[in-house]
Amino acid sequence: VPRWRQQWSGPGTTKRFPETVLARCVKYTEIHPEMRHVDCQSVWDAFKGAFISKHPCNITEEDYQPLMKLGTQTVPCNKILLWSRIKDLAHQFTQVQRDMFTLEDTLLGYLADDLTWCGEFNTSKINYQSCPDWRKDCSNNPVSVFWKTVSRRFAEAACDVVHVMLNGSRSKIFDKNSTFGSVEVHNLQPEKVQTLEAWVIHGGREDSRDLCQDPTIKELESIISKRNIQFSCKNIYRPDKFLQCVKNPEDSSCTSEI
């Protein structure tokens, strides 16, 4: 008789999850000399240990501590780019501006980027058919807790001027319920971070509004100011031109506003 299996509302573990994590770790440590000391088998064992045989709605940040320890990494604290609901452009930007880093440019962020995973209570099986959805099932699931943990650490490490890319096409440009709004904003350290600079990315070709005046941006400014961090905001009216100008700053068309 087949064992009853919990059916969750979200997609199951990404195909070849163990092989992918291990392969990404090997690749990352080959490319980044400062991480060559990392033992990828130990990294996978720690990752696996965080969720295997545990109920996928009862995962805690403590479960991920062994993995966090193994993945400890120093990135230039003044070169951090946070993002909310605009991952593609943020990654396109750091692919061009190689000295800036999103969370997914770090080892732990890269290991888990685009992946889903969960286990089952009291069995060593990985569930490839379904995993808990943050809204419909539970928030303390393996994926959400992982990103909450690494995002908090990433924000805590930031210093000087921290940039954040926000999606100007969304109804809530700044969303208090996003990882940026609920975790990263509250873990920037006022004694290290001087300014949070928001880049509001416009979606429409003819959109010339000043989205820095949006009520949700004003709300972000208020939260940041109360934490004794300065706030600044820039409209990026033409994201395509913005990236071109990052690539070729000497281009004559790059002196005008983008």
Epitope: K15, R16, E19, T20, A23, R24, V26, K27, Y28, K87, D88, H91, Q92, Q95, E104, D113, D114
Partner: antibody
Framework: QVQLVESGAEVKKPGASVKVSCRAS????????LHWVRQAPGQGLEWVGT????????TYAQKFQGRVAMTSDTSTSTVYMEVNRLRSDDTAVYFC???????????????????WGQGTTVTVSS | QAVVTQPPSVSAAPGQKVTISCSGS????????VSWYQQLPGTAPKLLIY???ERPSGIPGRFSGSKSGTSATLGITGLQTGDEADYYC???????????FGGGTKLTVL
């Protein structure tokens, strides 16, 4: 959600070139290989080649070697496939499809495509 | 002549089981993973099975895959009219250093 959106239909004359694009969204573009697969009218699937957007390394099917060029632009999350010296038997629907994680591809010959574009119809006719 | 061969067509009644074979050689199926795709009329193919017998999230348990030696098989149980489509196997060919597909099998649900 993960999506691949291809450029519109093309009509070309024999001997001309065509450049088809495939824009990726909803995932980190540089983490996965992208394949091109074509399907002539009423025929089966035929693999054309693959590109690793991180670095741009390519592998082509023998029959397309020297006539096909695949490139990627990480600033727009787009891959391109150019076919030169077009012949009437190049008339087909050209699909782009996401392949395996490119870190995995360093170790294994995985060959499966989990997300497909809608296809671009290329017609070669005099 | 395709490197990997499939029967051109198979048919069965609703609720029945059908199998589709895919035959190759040691340079492709014999030493590499096989995947299976479903292509409904006028649409792009969809991944049904990867790594010989694994189902992606969201693919019903009615679809199964297996491999033995240089042959692979796709099984579909509890046939539905919506399963009418072309089915393709795919694998890597180490000798050609290229991806290969079978010629495709048209499934008719009677």
């Amino acid at each position: 959600q993960v999506q691949l959106v291809e450029s519109g239909a093309e009509v070309k004359k024999p001997g001309a070139s065509v450049k088809v694009s495939c824009r990726a969204s909803g995932y980190t573009f540089t983490n996965y290989h992208l394949h091109w697969v074509r399907q002539a009218p009423g025929q089966g699937l035929e693999w054309v080649g693959t590109i690793n957007p991180r670095g741009g390394s390519t592998t082509y099917a023998q029959k397309f070697q020297g006539r096909v060029a695949m490139t990627s632009d990480t600033s727009t999350s787009t891959v391109y496939m150019e076919v030169n010296r077009l012949r009437s038997d190049d008339t087909a629907v050209y699909f782009c499809a996401r392949g395996s994680d490119n870190a995995l591809a360093d170790f294994y010959n995985y060959y499966d495509m989990d997300v497909w574009g809608q296809g671009t119809t290329v017609t070669v006719s005099s | 002549q395709a490197v990997v061969t499939q029967p051109p067509s198979v048919s069965a009644a609703p609720g029945q089981k059908v199998t589709i074979s895919c035959s190759g050689s040691s340079s492709n199926i014999g030493n590499n993973y096989v995947s299976w795709y479903q292509q409904l009329p006028g649409t792009a193919p969809k991944l049904l099975i990867y790594d010989n017998n694994e189902r992606p999230s969201g693919i019903p348990g009615r679809f199964s895959g297996s491999k033995s030696g240089t042959s692979a098989t796709l099984g579909i149980t509890g046939l539905q009219t919506g399963d009418e489509a072309d089915y393709y196997c795919g694998t890597w060919d180490s000798s050609l250093s290229a991806g290969v597909f079978g010629g495709g099998t048209k499934l008719t649900v009677l």
